[in-house]
Interface confidence: medium
């Protein structure tokens, strides 16, 4: 069952797939100048059995100046279901998806293929998220977002990544700030310190916000 | 004209591992982003609305963020919360909030 | 961004209480909703979508499709009259609806 949407966009990120689960197709696309061989493949498959898979088909470009063609129209994002993935190294790789049954790896390049891949993904699929340079991450989390099947409709889940920070600002590009876990089941309970009849819980257990105020003669 | 700080006191969570924010929420209305900080490292990031109005700062090794004014105005008259930006991002957990009136 | 909700929702006790908030690509975002009730602090009540924090009653359930978020209360109680905020984020920003009033009849 292919996804119907595309990963979420997360602003100042890009995502990719580790693998591919058996029944990914990609799209044959050629670079500017250049055009699918007229006998060629539409698409690559991953497919295989229990033990291995593999891509059919294979992706031949050549160039367009050899003959007199029509050009190709790209369809619209909204006409053409598109799966989007740049070639980014992911720092976070909690399995090696490439070892999985029923997984292909990353394609290899051929010849003349365009800088963008388009992938069509299959419910299943994980792909993994880190912001792209100069922006970090404001804390770890799971940074993945898979397709899932919910009721008959496919969506993509929504990874827990938020990219912030300019190239300028930033002192330490693409770092991420640890995020630790609250120590047990915290309690939302505060008190103001102004007026000071709030019961206070204060204990190793609970995450509290307080709040005071302090005032200085302005000079 | 006058200054004011006001400060927000975790406890309980590691303070310095959780971005800290400022929520203001004038009379009657609704809720405005302020800004954010890190306590870790002190790392601020300012709502365009309030950059340069306010200065949100954090001493990690007393768990708590403050925020700021050098020179009140009778706009600056509302409610500031602070907030935890919890696991997934949410705001889990404010505090009680602190009224600030400003008048002449 | 902006985020645009409904300045008041009026539903009858034990009825189902719809509550949206819209903006572009919310649906790829982030949406989360707290309830403020008068004179205390927001507090959370839907965390990504339609994940509900500890201690949150059943009936609150939230969805997210298109550019469109949505806060539904199935059984509203009166005790759920309160103001309703959605939040996303938008870089480092945080990003607030205007806050629906609702109201149980």
């Known amino acids: 069952e292919l996804c119907d949407d595309d990963p979420p966009e997360i602003p100042h990120a890009t995502f990719k797939a580790m693998a591919y689960k058996e029944g990914t197709m990609l799209n044959c696309e050629c670079k500017r100048g250049f055009r699918r061989i007229k006998s060629g493949s539409l698409y690559m498959l991953c497919t295989g059995n229990s033990s291995h898979s593999s891509w059919d088909n294979q992706c031949q470009c050549t160039s367009s100046a050899t003959r007199n063609t029509t050009k190709q129209v790209t369809p619209q994002p909204e006409e053409q279901k598109e799966r989007k993935t740049t070639e980014m190294q992911s720092p976070m790789q909690p399995v090696d998806q490439a070892s999985l049954p029923g997984h292909c790896r990353e394609p290899p390049p051929w010849e003349n293929e365009a800088t963008e891949r388009i992938y069509h993904f299959v419910v299943g699929q994980m792909v993994y998220y880190q912001c792209v340079q100069g922006y970090r991450a404001l804390h770890r989390g799971p940074a993945e977002s898979v397709c899932k099947m919910t009721h008959g409709k496919t969506r993509w889940t929504q990874p827990q990544l938020i990219c912030t920070g300019e190239m300028e600002t930033s002192q330490f590009p693409g770092e991420e700030k640890p995020q630790a876990s609250p120590e047990g089941r915290p309690e939302s309970e505060t008190s103001c310190l102004v007026t000071t009849t709030d019961f206070q819980i204060q204990t190793e257990m609970a995450a509290t916000m307080e709040t005071s105020i302090f005032t200085t003669e302005y000079q | 004209g006058e200054s004011l700080k006001i400060s927000c006191k975790g406890s309980?969570?590691?303070?310095?591992?959780?971005?800290i924010g400022w929520v203001r929420q004038m009379p009657g209305k609704g809720l405005e982003w302020m800004g954010l900080?890190?306590?870790?490292?002190?790392?601020?990031r300012y709502s365009p609305s309030f950059q340069g109005q306010v200065t949100i700062s954090a001493d990690k090794s007393i768990s708590t963020a403050y925020l700021q004014w050098s020179s009140l105005k009778a706009s600056d008259t509302a409610m500031y919360y602070c907030?935890?930006?919890?696991?997934?991002?949410?705001?889990?957990?404010w505090g009680q909030g602190t009224l600030v009136t400003v008048s002449s | 961004s902006v985020l645009t909700q409904p300045p008041s929702v009026s539903v009858s006790p034990g009825q189902t209480a719809s509550i949206t908030c819209s903006g572009h690509?919310?649906?790829?975002?982030?949406a989360y909703w707290y309830q403020q009730k008068p004179g205390q602090s927001p507090v959370l009540v839907i965390n990504?979508?339609?994940r509900r924090p500890s201690g949150i009653p059943e009936r609150f359930s939230g969805s997210n499709s298109g550019s469109t978020a949505t806060l539904t209360i199935s059984g509203t109680q009166a005790m759920d009259e309160a103001d309703y905020y959605c939040?996303?984020?938008?870089?480092?920003?945080?990003?607030f609806g205007g806050g629906t009033k609702l109201t149980v009849l």
């Open positions: 907030a935890r930006v919890g696991d997934g991002y949410s705001l889990d957990y």
């Open positions: 309980g969570y590691s303070f310095s591992t959780y971005w």
């Open positions: 900080i890190y306590p870790g490292d002190s790392d601020t």
């Open positions: 690509k919310l649906g790829e975002r982030f």
């Open positions: 990504q979508y339609i």
């Open positions: 939040q996303t984020w938008d870089g480092s920003i945080v990003v």
